[in-house]
């Protein structure tokens, strides 16, 4: 069937439309287009006889039409008057006529709309505002947007006049937003510029800040007032009902008790004509004295003395507070507070109790802090340490020893060699030493305040020959895959090279072996049973060398999964069953057996004479290493057959 399709159906003014012909019959003589729904010579647009290749314009031809050989008609520069029906009249070669009608609609390209308002400054909770989208356009749809969102559902919002007018009843400050209108028709859509609704509101009840109402004498009073309002409110201050000033902030420096009273802020909106007030009551207190700390013992001795710290002055009905190291008091049996919290007692002071200590007096407004107090705790001397740690020296070098002991006040030092007093200094220096300088070197530290003394003795050997070294270990029985072992080569000697051997070979390269401390220490990480070897350390310098006796590492391991022998699992009735269990382990494990889950004997070998089919079942060997704390087990199934029933069976042991 001959049909006409309009592309597009809705056409914008000034654009073009194609009346596209479908199912055009073959063997045509010609065709003609008409404006309207019927063939009318007065409304012919164009006619075309195919054989002539020449079209003939009709009375309705506007010059904007182009006819195509496939009978389609293009109309350009569309005008509003082009809207409507178009009829194609086709004449076939057999002179039989056929007709089809198509149509399209023409719409104007919409102009950019604008919003008009009946009230540019509506008052909150009082006025209504009507927005109208201009211009009024036929066949246009009107839409509204608030803050670029579609209109919210609200009983205060009403659309009218074909949605062209948006009315907001009883406006609120929340209606202050960006409003846009949009016009749409089938061929275009245009949005207006934003209109911002300026709602007049307030003032709300003002808020006075800061909120605190208690002040100390001598402080500055700085009050600020704010009330939500559009346009912004004008502010006035009253003190005890008397007008002070027309500002948003009220400032009174260096207040006294006389400034106590009621402070009123009044907010006024000149556009709405409304006033709101808020009152706050301010109380000014006299300044309390600054506290300070007294002590009953300014130089207490560690582990002997107690100290009582008292917060001064004593004031009735006052709360006293304490801080140590800028923290509130820790819970400790050595800290005691008096009933009124004014005295803090430290029982059996330690060097860590130095402080600082602060006390505070709490009043209605704040806490006044004392200056910090630091305790001078007398302690020590602790056991002195002599450095360096070398005990072996070569002749001709200088011997320089230093002594230090923790002490308050600092310790006084004395040096003795083989019991004979040498000098009263912290350092001992002897140049160009010989074998005669070997001996016992004693450092004595003395605290003159506590009267305590402590000594440390060091053996110094001066020799051209290096001594035979020895190996010390931090772990004599390490557990496999768990422990690390550190071997140290003794003694520590100046200008000495340290060497290590394992089973008579130089150290293998391994990520588990690490040398440190100038090669003096050899650490084995994650020891294994293969590390149970002979370890030797050596020391050497330019004139001599020496090796230690070997130290064999005793690595605790296992027990591994046990093995039951013999491997046979089938036996003849009447044979002897002799099962032996073995598991690699250090130390040797403890063995136990279970038959069908029932505990048997704690031996490595299980022996049963003259077995019968009753001895069928599961035989489990359990191994346990008390040193490593590890266990293991294995299960074996034993089958006993009546004599002569199955060839190839074991005759037993």
């Amino acid at each position: 069937k001959l049909t006409i399709e309009s592309t597009p159906f809705n056409v914008a003014e000034g654009k073009e439309v194609l009346l596209l012909v479908h199912n055009l019959p073959q063997h045509l003589f010609g065709y003609s287009w008409y404006k309207g729904e019927r063939v009318d010579g007065n409304r012919q647009i164009i006619g075309y006889v195919i054989g002539t290749q020449q079209a003939t314009p009709g009375p309705a031809y506007s010059g904007r039409e182009i006819i195509y050989p496939n009978a389609s008609l293009l109309i350009q520069n569309i005008i509003q008057n082009d809207t409507g029906f178009y009829t194609l009249h086709v004449i076939k070669s057999d002179l039989v006529n056929e007709e089809a009608t198509g149509q399209f609609r023409v719409y104007p390209e919409l102009p950019k709309p604008s919003i008009s308002s009946n009230n540019s400054k509506p008052v909150e909770d009082k006025d209504a505002v009507a927005f109208t989208c201009e211009p009024e356009t036929q066949d246009a749809t009107y839409l509204w947007w608030v803050n670029n969102q579609s209109l919210p559902v609200s009983p205060r919002l009403q659309l009218s006049n074909g949605n062209r007018t948006l009315t907001l009843f009883n406006v609120t400050r929340n209606d202050t937003a960006s409003y846009k209108c949009e016009t749409q028709n089938p061929v275009s859509a245009r949005r207006s510029d934003s209109v911002i609704l300026n709602v007049l509101y307030g003032p709300d009840a003002p808020t006075i800040s800061p909120l605190n109402t208690s002040y100390r004498s001598g402080e500055n009073l700085n009050l600020s007032c704010h009330a939500a309002s559009n346009p912004p409110a004008q502010y006035s201050w009253f003190v005890n009902g008397t007008f002070q000033q027309s500002t948003q902030e009220l400032f009174i420096p260096n207040i006294t008790v006389n400034n106590s009273g009621s402070y009123t802020c009044q907010a006024h909106n000149s556009d709405t004509g409304l006033n709101r007030t808020t009152v706050t009551t301010i109380t000014v207190y006299a300044e309390p004295p600054k506290p300070f700390i007294t002590s009953n013992n300014s130089n207490p001795v560690e582990d002997e003395d107690a100290v009582a710290l008292t917060c001064e002055p004593e004031i009735q009905n006052t709360t006293y507070l304490w801080w140590v190291n800028n923290q509130s008091l820790p819970v400790s049996p050595r800290l005691q507070l008096s009933n009124d919290n004014r005295t803090l007692t430290l029982l059996s002071v330690t060097r860590n109790d130095v402080g600082p200590y602060e006390c505070g007096i709490q009043n209605e407004l704040s806490v006044d802090h004392s200056d910090p107090v630091i305790l001078n705790v007398l302690y020590g001397p602790d056991d002195p340490t002599i450095s360096p740690s070398y005990t072996y020296y070569r002749p001709g070098v200088n011997l320089s020893l230093s002594c230090h002991a923790a002490s308050n006040p600092p310790a006084q030092y004395s040096w003795l060699i083989d019991g004979n007093i040498q000098q009263h200094t912290q350092e001992l220096f002897i140049s160009n030493i010989t074998e005669k300088n070997s001996g016992l070197y004693t450092c004595q530290a003395n605290n003159s305040a506590s009267g305590h003394s402590r000594t440390t003795v060091k053996t110094i050997t001066v020799s051209a020959e290096l001594p035979k070294p020895s190996i010390s270990s931090n772990n004599s029985k390490p557990v496999e895959d768990k422990d690390a072992v550190a071997f140290t080569c003794e003694p520590e000697a100046q200008n000495t090279t340290y060497l290590w051997w394992v089973n008579g070979q130089s150290l293998p390269v391994s990520p588990r072996l690490q040398l440190s401390n100038g090669n003096r220490t050899l650490t084995l990480f994650n020891v294994t049973r293969n590390d149970a070897r002979a370890y030797v350390c050596g020391i050497q310098n330019s004139v001599s060398a020496n090796r230690s006796d070997p130290v064999t590492l005793d690595v605790l391991y296992g027990p591994d999964t046990p093995i039951i022998s013999p491997p046979d699992s089938s036996y003849l009735s009447g044979a002897n069953l002799n099962l032996s269990c073995h598991s690699a382990s250090n130390p040797s494990p403890q063995y136990s057996w279970r038959i069908n889950g029932i505990p048997q004997q704690h031996t490595q070998v299980l022996f049963i004479a003259k077995i019968t089919p009753n001895n069928n079942g599961t035989y489990a060997c359990f191994v346990s290493n008390l040193a490593t704390g590890r266990n293991n087990s294995i299960v074996k199934s034993i089958t006993v057959s009546a004599s002569g029933t199955s060839p190839g069976l074991s005759a037993g042991a």
Partner: antibody, heavy 118, light 106 residues
């Protein structure tokens, strides 16, 4: 897109014959007529006539009756202009143009220069 | 045959300016007037058909008007690429006629 491509320039002696081609593409050749236009050196355009590509019937204006012939090779979508017994005054650029169904020429070839000189 | 009188035969104008060409016919051609732009070495280019209908893709700087026997063609806001020869064509009867052409210089 619709294109008309003409053959290259020709240099002929008086009395000879020339045949210019115009190959169409981008549309159905037999649905639009083909016109021929002459532009003599320094002169304006002169419409020579047209050929109905559906029926093959040519139309010539009086000035171009006799020695001038329009023809078609429909299978090749090509129109031809043949000028017999060339004269010096035939020296010109010849354009082919597609004839819209209403009569004006909407698409043109690039032109073919014919020079007649002894 | 319908006779065509195109004037002027040449004219000069300034960039950004406006020019107008006229065509008179010996009889009423019922608005079947077309206007062409022709540049050397190229085929003519159809600008306007049926007196005033602009061909697709032709800038709106070009315009045409007229009826009966008097027709005009205008270019406003002249640009350098407008340098060409312009021809009118009547296609009212089956014997078409070009005007003599107007050479535009800038």
């Amino acid at each position: 897109q619709i294109q008309l491509v003409q053959s290259g320039p020709e240099l002929k002696k008086p009395g000879e014959t020339v045949k210019i081609s115009c190959k169409a593409s981008g549309y159905t050749f037999t649905t639009y007529g083909m016109t021929w236009v002459k532009q003599a050196p320094g002169k304006g355009l002169k419409w020579m006539g047209w050929i109905n590509t559906y029926s093959g019937v040519p139309t010539y204006i009086d000035d171009f009756k006799g020695r001038f012939a329009f023809s078609l090779e429909t299978s090749a979508s090509t129109a031809y202009l043949q000028i017999n017994n060339l004269k010096n005054e035939d020296t010109a650029t010849y354009f082919c143009g597609r004839k819209d169904l209403l009569g004006f020429m909407d698409y043109w070839g690039q032109g073919t220069s014919v020079t007649v000189s002894s | 045959d319908i006779q065509m009188t195109q004037s002027p035969s040449s004219l000069s104008a300034s960039l950004g300016g406006k020019v107008t060409i006229t065509c008179k016919t010996s009889q009423d051609i019922n608005k079947f007037m077309a206007w062409y732009q022709h540049k050397p070495g190229k085929g003519p280019r159809l600008l306007i058909r049926y007196t005033s209908t602009l061909q697709p893709g032709i800038p709106s700087r070009f315009s045409g008007s007229g009826s009966g026997r008097d027709y005009s063609f205008s270019i406003r806001n002249l640009e350098p690429e407008d340098i060409a020869t312009y021809y009118c064509l009547q296609y009212d009867d089956l014997t078409w006629t070009f005007g003599g052409g107007t050479k535009l210089e800038i």
